[in-house]
């Protein structure tokens, strides 16, 4: 905490420009109006300020706003945006997505911290649900944003959202949230034809029942090896050998490559040798 | 050991078919799918299309679809490609190759188109 | 269909040297389940068939000189000839497996002074 001193003759700000650059710590506290600085949060950005510097600036941000910052002053926080805490921004509230893109932007290129993860959670709370535009932006910043949330919480995204996930999105995605995802990605592309519909759901697909698989392969989808073993174990096992062979197409032929990993191994152990025969892989049952 | 074995030279006529072979010794032959493989000077190789030896299942790359046909003879081990309507294009060495990783290349089959 | 670019295009070493040429696909060749990258390289001889090298990207196939190492995941790949001999002369391919159709990268030509 800076004690409160009297601002040195001459020395008061009367806009937040480089010169302060040159302000010891106390100066800063004494010298620098609050509402001033709220007012022009964009220029703190552009002046190479100390970190302990941003320390006192953050202290006068907080003495006069001790309810939590109002989102003009949020949207322009730049690298002060580092400073604050989880608990500092409980406080605030988020509706604008620039303001969302202008924080995030400040963090790119490093891990999720504690700061952005508060920060994503009060802007989809305060919006209700975690819409199109939300997505395709956190995404954006995070691929692996999706499947960080719980399938509780990934409950709340609308099908039409789905539209906004890539396939990298879900890469880290365990099956318990690709069973939650699947139905709405299911939803989404409903009316799509046959071949589009695939492209867009082949990535949910680690969530897809025995029965979608068995209409899948009625259509000539030629899914590959690594589609086929993200699928879930219990959808794979009541499929046919004949069934297998026309949901993979020609990439039924990796199913030897592959024939020591799940699911494949335990699928090949359900079907009669003489079924594993046509597939010409010397597969043994 | 492994061979796939493939006659060396095919000279034809632009608008006429050729059928290809390649017997395979040395292995069982419907254990392993085959491919074929299309190599033209300077060009690199293209991948035709695969059969599955045991039930004669086949998958073209679309651009060969209406040029090549691929079926088997189980009873002696060889595989056979018939490429149709032949032009000067269609002028490359083809090889037939086994398996998943080509692990076993045939000798290779110059197709020379040429009135 | 996925692209593959090799690099370069040709080579010109010294017997005893090391040779690093490159192989990238336009898609991650990498499934994740199996940890595997759906990629092999050839080496084709002058006027000889193609003969594998290394599949899933790293696995030498058996009677391959150790010099040969394959490494690379996902969509950037290499092969790596330790010490060139002069029997190591030819056109270089990688190719994909991980989708139909198969497709082969343009080759690398080493030369061996």
């Known amino acids: 905490e800076v004690e409160k001193t009297a601002c040195p003759s001459g020395k008061k700000a009367p806009e937040i420009d480089e010169s302060l650059i040159f302000y010891k710590k106390w100066e800063l506290e004494a010298c620098v109006d609050a509402a001033l600085l709220a007012t022009q949060m964009d220029r703190v950005n552009a002046i190479p300020f100390t970190y302990e510097q941003l320390d006192v600036l953050k202290h006068k941000l907080d003495e006069l706003y001790p309810q939590g910052y109002p989102e003009s002053v949020i949207q322009h926080l730049g690298y002060l945006f580092l400073k604050m805490s989880p608990e500092d921004i409980r406080k605030w509230n988020v509706t604008s997505l620039e303001t969302l893109k202008a924080l995030l932007e400040v963090n790119k290129g490093h891990e999720m911290s504690p700061q952005v993860a508060t920060l994503i959670d009060r802007f989809v709370k305060g919006r209700g649900q975690l819409d199109k535009d939300t997505l395709d932006t956190l995404t954006a910043f995070y691929p692996g944003y999706l499947c960080s949330l719980s399938p509780e919480e990934l409950s709340s995204v609308p099908p039409s959202s789905i539209w906004a996930v890539r396939p990298q999105d879900l890469d880290t995605c365990d099956p318990r949230q690709l069973d939650v995802l699947y139905p709405k990605a299911r939803l989404a592309f409903q009316n799509m034809n046959g071949s589009e519909y695939f492209v867009k759901i082949q990535s949910f697909l680690g969530g897809a029942p025995t029965e979608d698989l068995k209409a899948l392969s009625q259509q000539n989808v030629s899914m590959d090896l690594a589609t086929f073993m993200k699928l879930r174990t219990d959808a794979v096992l009541p499929l046919t050998v004949a069934e297998v062979q026309k949901l993979l197409g020609p990439h039924v032929e990796g199913l030897k490559a592959e024939e020591r990993h799940r699911p494949v191994r335990d699928w090949i152990l359900r079907q009669r040798q003489d079924d594993l025969d046509t597939l010409g892989l010397g597969l043994q049952g | 050991q492994v061979q796939l074995q493939q006659p060396g030279t095919e000279l034809v006529k632009p608008g006429a078919s050729v059928k290809l072979s390649c017997k395979a010794s040395?292995?069982?032959?419907?254990?392993?799918?085959m491919h074929w493989v299309k190599q033209r000077p300077g060009q690199g190789l293209e991948w035709i299309g695969s059969i599955n030896p045991s039930n004669g299942d086949t998958y073209y790359n679309e651009k060969f679809k209406n040029k090549a046909t691929l079926t088997v003879d189980k009873s002696s081990s060889t595989a056979y490609m018939q490429l149709s309507s032949l032009t000067s294009d269609d002028s490359a060495v083809y090889y037939c190759?086994?398996?998943?990783?080509?692990?076993?290349w045939g000798t290779g089959t110059t197709v020379t188109v040429s009135s | 269909d996925i692209v593959m670019t090799q690099s370069p295009s040709s080579l010109t070493v010294s017997v005893g040297q090391k040779v690093t040429m490159s192989c990238k696909s336009s898609q991650s060749l990498l499934n994740s389940s199996s940890q595997k990258n759906y990629l092999a390289w050839y080496q084709q001889k002058p006027g000889q068939s193609p003969k594998l090298l290394v599949y899933f990207a790293s696995t030498r196939e058996s009677g391959v000189p150790d010099r040969f190492i394959g490494s690379g995941s996902g969509t950037d790949f290499t092969l790596i000839i330790s010490s060139v001999q002069a029997e190591d002369l030819a056109d270089y391919f990688c190719q994909q497996h991980y989708s139909t159709p198969r497709t082969f990268g343009g080759g690398t030509k080493l030369e061996i002074i």
């Open positions: 040395d292995y069982t032959f419907t254990s392993y799918w």
């Open positions: 190759a086994r398996g998943w990783y080509f692990d076993v």
